[in-house]
Amino acid sequence: QRVPKEGQTFFQKPESCPSVPEGSLKLDLGIINANQRVPLSRNIERRSTSPWNYTVTWDPNRYPSEVVQAQCRHLGCVNAQGKEDIFMNSVPIQQETLVLRRKHQGCSVSFQLEKLLVTVGCTCVKPLIHHVH
Amino acid sequence: QRVPKEGQTFFQKPESCPSVPEGSLKLDLGIINANQRVPLSRNIERRSTSPWNYTVTWDPNRYPSEVVQAQCRHLGCVNAQGKEDIFMNSVPIQQETLVLRRKHQGCSVSFQLEKLLVTVGCTCVKPLIHHVH
């Protein structure tokens, strides 16, 4: 649960200011650009040559509580004839994202950032071939 | 900057507890799973049939300060011969992510969550064809 190097300075007050009480910060309520949404996908996940399914994970002590993970449907990619081509690869595209974890002990509630690895979709890749001797 | 419906209950204390001072919460220092990383991409963005480039955006008052955005290289997809096939589409895959925004007025520092739309990569899609009469 350490703070990454970049974060060490990010969470500090300017040097000329009295230092912050160790271990906690002030988080303002509300979310900037809360209404920003990914445009409707027009079924990209079904029409891609590397199609994928979605699984929804739910955790009431996480914000957002609902996180969607993609899984590639095939090992290979779908060709123009709609058949799987195993000489190509469906490969997951992953993204590091932040979520907010809620922690409570009795009536004392605090929050902490958590890094999460999300698979967002899949892409079709032509692998290089190596013969092992 | 309103709190989405789900967030309204997420940020509240249990009903039996004295209510939280309006407008701010306690954020613990440190990031859970800070070391979690997307596995090295092995040049997925170059070998994909819908290849993409990356642009890095930098904001010192955002955590993480560095956010990487993908842009599809072509309108079409790259076929087996390495040529662009304009009858297929390279389509961006987008993801909503949270970042932390730092706000300071003099020595008073506070933080707020911000929603960001990130393009993570591209996928190759067979477009639906409509003939307009």
């Epitope: 090992l75 490969v91 890749v125 692998p127 290089l128 071939i129 | 092995r42």
Partner: nanobody, 116 residues
């Protein structure tokens, strides 16, 4: 560099079973999937079975569905192909394939012969 060691090939009678194993070593990290192809003289290599590393999702060629089972051991970086109810048409050189998304490694192959 990646090494693949295949084992378990041999000669059997129709209806018998064989188990092929493949172990990966070297820089075999970030595995996408692991599997087997086969080839008979004068024919293209054909996919037999594959298993995705992240979630153990499996795929099989129609010709082996219900007879062959692929499994993996994440800790040891190994994949096994259990081949039951073997037929003479399963005779081929079986190649282990390790897929790292943008690079695919092919083993040297192990001969499987099924006589009637």
């Amino acid at each position: 560099e990646v090494q693949l060691v295949e084992s378990g090939g041999g000669s059997v009678q129709a209806g018998d079973s064989l188990r092929l194993s493949c172990a990966a070593s070297g820089r075999a990290n970030s595995i996408n999937w692991f599997g087997w192809f086969r080839q008979t003289p004068g024919k293209e290599r054909e996919f037999v079975a594959g298993i995705r590393w992240s979630d153990a999702y499996t795929e099989y060629a129609n010709s082996v569905k219900g007879r062959f089972t692929i499994s993996r051991d994440n800790a040891k970086n190994t994949v096994d192909l259990q081949m039951d109810s073997l037929k003479p048409e399963d005779t081929a050189v079986y190649y282990c394939v390790l897929d790292l998304s943008t690079v695919r490694y092919w083993g040297q192959g192990t001969q499987v012969t099924v006589s009637s």
